[in-house]
Interface confidence: medium
């Protein structure tokens, strides 16, 4: 007997994972055999669509490889011409393990700004997103929040926020981890310890100390009266993102010393500055004060010039007389770089004997100045051109320091050997007599301003020059 179709197993909701097989069953009892058709979201599924398999006279619909887009309502309709057509519907829910579609990336950010690390996900059920910093789950607080999108937002970024982050997407089907990314927090350069101002005696050694921090670790430069520091030694050390710079100075003039800490953020720089003043107590002391003691010279610069066993006057107005006077000579020679071979040994002899003056021991040790005649011999014969250049530079303020003023004596203020032969010192290295003068280059004036005496000659008419410390 003919029988109208009856669906004996109504369609149910089917859960399927992406790329897996999903099957709907629509069991029908009827006579004659019905025609069964299938729709998805009310659109007919064509029998020749290769994504589907329809079997058992149309009672089984199989989706061979489920895709996200297969989500929807599937209906089967049975009709055999006896009575009306019957329909049963069921949903396909495509389930998906978590997938991170926009992973976080490395971020460099300046302290105090806002940082956002993206983490966009897919999945069904919708994944929950959490974050790991280092090895520990990240706790949200007033500054740190995980947004609805899964991204991590950090307000007012702090140094301690720096580190390695990864996001974790989780649902009932599984867990997905992003790659580890780095959040680098850059910090503007900041000075932790500013150099201190000092009031010191002429010839002292002073160490200015400047400590700075920042990320990246800043570099420290020193400025002296607006220019890069030209002398002094700088020692630097870096520990725990703190740079420590010490500038050791030999003080021969007052100055403003500025410590500048600089670091770079992308294409921009940040700087921090701190300044200290160095003032000199009793500025005129080195010229006027004769306090000191006699001692054998044990330095290097004047080795070849000073008499081997001579006592020299060490001026205690310097913190470390020996070192200060040694450095004065060395610096003076550097100040007078371009000199002729004729001038050099004479200038060395003059400088050494002027700075390391012969010393007369006694109850009050006394320095013995160079005889005026020897000073003038250097000035007007050996080093006439050089002396003019130096005086011109002095007037025009081209010297870096006041050192040369102490290094080169004013001949006119020195005692003459004609007044008291014991009151002044001769320069044994000016080894010539009046007959030698014909060999010297032309003088700037027609005749010396003082009668040059016959100085004791020796077997050699050449000058003794220290090979280590020459002026060129």
């Amino acid at each position: 007997l003919p029988k109208a179709p009856v669906i004996t197993t109504p369609l149910e909701t089917v859960d399927a994972l992406v790329e897996e097989v999903a099957t709907f069953m629509c069991a029908v009892e009827s006579y004659p055999q019905p025609e069964i058709s299938w729709t998805r979201n009310k659109i007919l599924i064509k029998l020749f669509d290769t994504r589907y398999s329809i079997r058992e006279n149309g009672q089984l619909l199989t989706i061979l490889s489920v895709e996200d887009s297969d989500d929807g309502i599937y209906c089967c309709t049975a009709n055999n011409g006896v009575g009306g057509a019957v329909e049963s519907c069921g949903a396909l829910q495509v389930k998906m393990k978590p997938k991170i579609t926009r992973p976080p990336i490395n971020v460099k950010i300046i302290e105090g700004l806002k940082a956002v690390l993206p983490c966009t996900t897919m999945g069904n059920p919708k994944p929950s997103v959490s974050w790991i910093k280092g090895d520990s789950p990240l706790r949200e607080n007033s500054r740190i929040a995980v947004l609805e999108s899964g991204s991590l937002r950090i307000h007012n970024v702090q140094k301690e926020d720096a580190g390695q982050y990864r996001c974790v997407a989780k649902n009932s089907l599984g867990t997905a981890y992003s790659k580890v990314v780095k959040l680098e927090v850059e910090v503007f350069a900041r000075i932790l310890r500013a150099p201190e101002s000092h009031n010191v005696t002429f010839g002292s050694f002073v160490t200015l100390h400047c400590t700075a921090t920042g990320i990246p670790v800043p570099t420290i430069t020193w400025i002296e009266n607006g220019n890069a520091v030209s002398s002094g030694s700088i020692q630097e050390s870096v520990k725990d993102r703190v740079i420590d710079s010490r500038l050791q100075l030999f003080i021969t003039k007052p100055g403003l010393y500025t410590c500048i800490a600089t670091n770079k953020h992308g294409e921009k720089f940040s700087t921090a500055k701190a300044a200290a003043t160095i003032s000199i107590a009793e500025w005129s002391k080195p010229q006027k004060d004769n306090k000191g003691y006699c001692a054998q010279y044990r330095g290097e610069v004047c080795n070849a010039v000073l008499a081997k066993d001579a006592l020299v006057f060490l001026n205690t107005s310097y913190a470390d007389p020996e070192e200060a006077q040694e450095l004065l000579v060395h610096t003076a020679w550097n100040e007078l770089k371009v000199v002729s071979p004729v001038c050099r040994p004479a200038a060395e002899a003059l400088l050494c004997n002027h700075i390391f003056q012969e010393c007369s021991p006694g109850v009050v040790p006394t320095p013995i100045p160079i005889c005026r005649e020897y000073c003038l011999a250097v000035k007007e014969l050996f080093c006439a051109k050089e002396w003019l250049v130096m005086e011109e530079k002095t007037h025009r303020g081209l010297y870096r320091s006041e050192m040369h003023l102490l290094s080169v004596p004013e001949c006119s203020k020195l005692p003459s050997m004609h007044w008291d032969p014991t009151a002044c010192a001769r320069l044994p290295h000016l080894d010539y007599n009046k007959e030698n003068l014909k060999t010297f280059p032309p003088m700037t004036s027609s005749k010396p301003s003082v009668d040059i005496p016959n100085l004791p000659s020796s077997s050699s008419s050449s000058f003794s020059v220290s090979p280590t410390y020459s002026m060129t």
Partner: antibody, heavy 121, light 112 residues
Framework: EVQLLESGGGLVQPGGSLRLSCAAS????????MSWVRQAPGKGLEWVSA????????YYKESVKGRFTISRDNSKNTLYLQMNSLRAEDTAVYYC??????????????WGQGTLVTVSS | QTVVTQEPSFSVSPGGTVTLTCGLS?????????PDWYQQTPGQAPRTLIY???SRHSGVPDRFSGSILGNKAALTITGAQADDESDYYC????????????FGGGTKLTVL
Amino acid sequence: EVQLLESGGGLVQPGGSLRLSCAASGFTFSDYGMSWVRQAPGKGLEWVSAIPWQGGSTYYKESVKGRFTISRDNSKNTLYLQMNSLRAEDTAVYYCAKRSGRIAFGALDAWGQGTLVTVSS
Amino acid sequence: QTVVTQEPSFSVSPGGTVTLTCGLSSGSVTSSNYPDWYQQTPGQAPRTLIYSTDSRHSGVPDRFSGSILGNKAALTITGAQADDESDYYCGLYMYSGSKNYVFGGGTKLTVL
């Protein structure tokens, strides 16, 4: 912090050679004179050699003159002592010492821990 | 050859004062010898106490002082402490034709 680290000591036969090195850190090496001082086992200190900041002059104890050579490489912050024709009486701990200033004969104000040189057959 | 002389040993009571001296076998020690003083405990490197007669090295307590006494250099320790027990060496700059630096034989100081 000033640090001086000697190396190169060891056992050597009489007539042999050794080169001691002293790596300096914590100060501007090129601004200071340096010295080598030795101490024989159970004996007192004995100055061996000195060199000023720029290395132009060198100074030696009479008994090592012509056998020992002091030198420095300011670019490497290193002081050296080349010891040739070694004798049994050269056996000692050799200390590298920093001078208080540029000159070769300033006070010795910082010392290394020393390296032992043993001259024996 | 000039020898630098020091007392081989010396003892002092805790809290007491002791003066160690440094002389020359011929001649006097003067400021031209720039006397320096060093302390050495067994197994350790020497430590600088005083340089150029009377300048105290940084970090050295003011119990230690240097001077010239008569024809010798002197190191005075006031308020001696147990950890002052050490060997003390003087060093002199010498010039006799060539520059030289000579240590004394050392003084063993015992704090009883």
